[in-house]
């Protein structure tokens, strides 16, 4: 089939980085500057993406692959192929249309992007809170209250294991 296709369509022999030039009797010509073809058999080369302004060049365009952009520090990429730049926030914040706002009590965000998420509810797993949550960090769940030694509060770590044969003081 490939052999048949080649006989029918001389353009199928043109490799990536070239195009099948109809103006030159279907000879494979190299892509002109600032253009590329990422697959063989192309009749035209695509124009390279230009990373302008706040879009910075992460990878230069070559004859076989498009340029890749990222965003200036302070912003991060969104969308296919970094089609948008969205502002970063600090940990403990989320982005709203009013800008970066602190996470509400009971929620956290440990990244520069994304939304504030509720703290883990330790009691749903029958566990206690070992370390309280903050705007930047989730709670740390510890053993279940029943596993704690008598008198221990839910926010303190369990007492160290005792040697066999010793009774509590």
């Amino acid at each position: 089939f490939e052999r048949t296709r080649s006989l029918q369509d001389p353009c199928s022999n043109c490799p990536a980085g070239t195009f099948c030039d109809n103006n030159r009797n279907q000879i494979c010509s190299p892509c002109p500057p600032n253009s590329f073809s990422s697959a063989g058999g192309q009749r035209t080369c695509d124009i390279c993406r230009q990373c302008k302004g706040v879009f910075r060049t992460r990878k230069e365009c070559s004859s076989t692959s498009n340029a890749e952009c990222d965003c200036t520090p302070g912003f991060h990429c969104l969308g296919a192929g970094c089609s948008m730049c969205e502002q970063d926030c600090k940990q403990g914040q989320e982005l709203t249309k009013k800008g970066c706002k602190d996470c509400c009590f009971g929620t956290f965000n440990d990244q520069k992007r994304g939304i504030c998420r509720p703290w883990t509810n330790c009691s749903l797993d029958g566990k206690s809170v070992l370390v309280n949550g903050t705007k930047e960090r989730d709670v740390v769940c510890g053993p279940s209250p029943a596993d704690l030694s008598p008198g221990a509060s839910s926010v303190t770590p369990p007492a160290p294991a005792r040697e066999p044969g010793h009774s509590p003081q």
Epitope: V54, L78, G79, S83, M84, C85, E86, T96, K97
Partner: nanobody
Framework: EVQLVESGGGLVQPGGSLRLSCAAS????????MNWARQAPGKELEWVAN????????YYVDSVEGRFTISRDNANNSLYLQMNSLRAEDTAVYYC????????????????WGLGTTVTVSS
């Protein structure tokens, strides 16, 4: 071609005022949120202000609240930033940016940016 072109930057003394303009072309301006962002020398890019499609919602970063005013003229495809009581720390390249489709709902990404206009506040 979709394009944003800023103008109006320059040198101004502390306490002075400037009005930046952004001319939009190649897209339906009135259907997009629009933004201003800035990058001070040696600092990260910072969002400054945004405005919704009809100008009824406007938001600002805390550091410019009460001093800067964002506005738009949909009939003339123009965005503005009136900057009053300017300070040395407002020195930056100011960028106009279009909110992408879904801005304010699913994300706050900006997909079209101008090349910027430079504001220098110095005595």
């Amino acid at each position: 071609e979709v394009q944003l072109v800023e103008s109006g930057g320059g040198l101004v003394q502390p306490g002075g005022s400037l009005r930046l303009s952004c001319a939009a072309s190649g897209f339906t301006f009135s259907t997009h949120w629009m933004n201003w962002a800035r990058q001070a020398p040696g600092k990260e890019l910072e969002w400054v202000a945004n405005i919704n499609q009809d100008g009824s919602e406007k938001y600002y970063v805390d550091s410019v609240e009460g001093r800067f005013t964002i506005s738009r003229d949909n009939a003339n495809n123009s965005l503005y930033l009136q900057m009053n009581s300017l300070r040395a720390e407002d020195t930056a390249v100011y960028y106009c940016a279009r909110g992408g489709v879904g801005y304010g709902d699913s994300h706050f990404g900006m997909d079209v940016w101008g090349l910027g206009t430079t504001v220098t506040v110095s005595s």
